[in-house]
């Protein structure tokens, strides 16, 4: 079946700025028209596309949640970049929300890694040096990193 055989019977209503597809694909920052004849620009700050594509619509921009800071705004070619606020982090296995970092390590453990937007503080057993991955105790006890020096909070 040729494209001529399948010529569309109607044209889509005019929308944003248009250009022509290249080999049936539109460049980043655009989506394709229903009839495949035009590339239509995404709306700045509303939607985006990152790759050459033949999709009928651009992808909706992410809105940063409360508890997140916007590192960079949404453009027509790149989604918003959001990051957890200081003192909170987002884990890979629970990406839907920022969680508060622990303020210290359980008894018998020392802090070896700070709170970052991507990870909680990292604690290891004093003696063995193995990482702690268990739940935080009900009553969190801040332990000393070295004699007389309290473990530092997330920064």
């Amino acid at each position: 079946i040729t494209q001529q055989d399948l010529a569309p019977q109607q044209r889509a209503a005019p929308q944003q700025k248009r250009s022509s597809p290249s080999e049936g694909l539109c460049p980043p920052g655009h989506h394709i028209s229903e009839d495949g004849r035009d590339c239509i620009s995404c709306k700045y700050g509303q939607d985006y596309s990152t790759h050459w594509n033949d999709l009928l619509f651009c992808l909706r921009c992410t809105r940063c949640d409360s508890g997140e800071v916007e590192l960079s705004p949404c453009t027509t070619t790149r989604n918003t970049v959001c990051q957890c606020e200081e003192g909170t982090f987002r884990e890979e296995d629970s990406p839907e929300m920022c969680r508060k970092c622990r303020t210290g390590c359980p008894r018998g453990m020392v802090k070896v890694g700070d709170c970052t937007p991507w990870s909680d503080i990292e604690c290891v057993h004093k003696e063995s040096g193995t990482k702690h991955s268990g739940e935080v105790p009900a009553v969190e006890e801040t332990v000393t990193s070295s004699p007389g020096t309290p473990a530092s909070p997330c920064s």
């Epitope: 399948l6 569309p8 109607q10 044209r11 889509a12 049936g24 394709i32 229903e34 033949d54 009928l56």
Partner: nanobody, 123 residues
Framework: EVQLLESGGGEVQPGGSLRLSCAAS????????MGWFRQAPGKEREFVSA????????YYAESVKGRFTISRDNAKNTVYLQMSSLRAEDTAVYYC????????????????WGQGTLVTVSS
């Protein structure tokens, strides 16, 4: 979850008519196309017709132009294929499918498929 339910298939004599329906649920895309494909025994699945939701752009395969008409009911999320002047070579299982790509007349451009409804044209 996208679900497509075809209906309206059956047996008809040459020159007769049938209307196929495809009801879609679970579609949350800003725009999409719904197409009809058919597959005769021992043959590859082939494009028949497609219609787009926002602009209403329509496509037909050359073999059905002037005999088949595709239409949509936006409120019901349903697409129809009115088939007339049916021929023995129109006998096939007719599938409804959904695409989020433009100018979608190839099978691989469709992401969601119905189970199909059988159309038999026989005297």
């Amino acid at each position: 979850e996208v679900q497509l339910l075809e209906s309206g298939g059956g047996e008809v004599q040459p020159g007769g008519s049938l209307r196929l329906s495809c009801a879609a649920s679970g579609l949350t895309f800003p725009n999409y196309g719904m197409g009809w494909f058919r597959q005769a025994p021992g043959k590859e699945r082939e494009f028949v017709s497609a219609i787009y939701w926002s602009g209403g752009t329509v496509y037909y395969a050359e073999s059905v132009k002037g005999r088949f008409t595709i239409s949509r009911d936006n409120a019901k999320n349903t697409v129809y294929l009115q088939m007339s002047s049916l021929r023995a070579e129109d006998t096939a299982v007719y599938y409804c499918a959904v695409t989020i790509r433009g100018a979608a007349t190839q099978t691989w451009k469709y992401d969601y498929w119905g189970q199909g409804t059988l159309v038999t044209v026989s005297s």
